[in-house]
């Protein structure tokens, strides 16, 4: 999906009002220095691409993020504020239902959510140079 035509300010508002707090709740008890940010993004569409990938694509050691509250709210925000996003996700959602797993908070998941926090911060940060 190409995130270029999303309403970035509306997505930012959704992040600030709820998603950020859900991420903090998920990470509660974890030190901010525990994980190094290894995933980065260069502009808002790129950040959303990386955020979508880390939030919804199962990875080795962390298959359960898509059912977390922050993930559901991220999905809702993208569906509302990114034209055509919902349509591209129908097949992906059906595939997810088939391989639904029990929610387990592993260290790998905590690391992944730490990366997500960094990506969201970059999505929101003011530009220093005009793109």
């Amino acid at each position: 999906y190409d995130f270029t035509n999303c309403d970035f300010e509306k997505i930012k508002a959704a992040y600030l009002s709820t998603i950020s707090k859900d991420l903090i709740t998920y990470m509660s008890g974890t030190k901010s220095t525990e994980f190094n940010n290894t995933v980065s993004c260069s502009n808002r569409p790129h950040c959303l691409t990386e955020i979508q990938s880390l939030t919804f694509n199962p990875t080795a050691g962390c298959a359960s993020l898509a059912k977390e509250m922050f993930a559901m709210k991220t999905k809702a925000a993208l569906a509302i504020w990114c034209p055509g996003y919902s349509e591209t996700q129908i097949n992906a959602t059906q595939a997810m239902k088939k391989r639904r797993k029990r929610k387990v908070t592993t260290n790998k998941c905590l690391e992944q959510v730490s990366q997500l926090q960094g990506l969201w911060r970059r999505f929101n940060r003011p530009l220093l140079k005009q793109q």
């Epitope: 300010e9 930012k12 992040y15 600030l16 950020s20 903090i24 901010s32 220095t33 190094n36 940010n37 926090q117 960094g118 969201w120 911060r121 929101n124 940060r125 003011p126 220093l128 140079k129």
Partner: antibody, heavy 120, light 105 residues
């Protein structure tokens, strides 16, 4: 715990330059912008500029474009601000400030400030 | 540049009183942040992005507003609230308001 430790007070003569430091700890230095803010005695806060320690990109308040130079030393997690051609108008407390964890437009962490006094 | 005008510049309040400090922007901004600065110390973030309470800030502080008008409310003033309060926005580049000095009667 996030900490910003600034260098001590300085007394400098008009026309001279001064370079102050802001040593960051408790987080990954290159992950957050570093802002610099001026506060003259009894006055409000004035944003000077910001630097991205990751790539040294900077943005300035136009008023300080020719007055301030912002740099970083990634190896020591330290940000620097140099002020040139000092006059009495530059006498102030200068703060470094880091953005919030959620979004960097709000300044959640501040150094203790460096007092610069310009006097003959 | 967006100019932020705070009013009043000085306010005197009694303990337990509810007070509201205002910040007016010269043109519309998306968000406002608020800081408290006590004498001889660095500013402290109180409210970020208009209405979010910063970590460790008492719940008697709240923020609201949109467009060109924003406000900070203290529901029940305490002695320790005596300080200068600044609003702050970052649109094209950051600016701060002139501040409101809160004195306790």
């Amino acid at each position: 715990e996030v900490q910003l430790q600034q260098s001590g007070p300085v007394l400098v003569k008009p026309g001279a330059s001064v370079k102050m430091s802001c040593k960051a700890s408790g987080y990954t230095f290159t992950d957050y912008y570093m802002n610099w803010v001026k506060q003259s005695h009894g006055k409000s806060l004035e944003w000077i500029g910001v630097i991205n320690p990751y790539n040294a990109d900077t943005k300035f308040n136009q008023r300080f474009k020719d007055k301030a130079t912002l740099t970083v030393d990634e190896s020591s997690s330290t940000a620097y601000m140099e002020l040139n051609s000092l006059t009495s108008e530059d006498s102030a407390v200068y703060y470094c400030a880091r953005g919030d964890d959620y979004a960097e437009e709000s300044f959640a962490y501040w150094g203790q400030g460096t007092l610069v006094t310009v006097s003959a | 540049q967006i100019v932020l005008t705070q009013s009043p510049s000085i306010m005197s309040a009694s303990l337990g009183e509810e007070i509201t400090l205002t910040c007016s922007a010269s043109s519309s901004v998306s968000y406002m942040h608020w800081y408290q600065q006590k004498s001889g110390t660095s500013p402290k973030l109180l409210i970020y992005f208009t209405s979010n309470l910063a970590s460790g800030v008492p719940s008697r502080f709240s923020g609201s507003g949109s467009g060109t008008f924003y406000s900070l409310t203290i529901s029940s003033v305490e002695a320790e609230d005596a300080a200068d309060y600044y609003c702050h926005q970052w649109s094209s580049y950051p600016t701060f308001g002139g501040g409101t000095k809160l004195e306790i009667k």
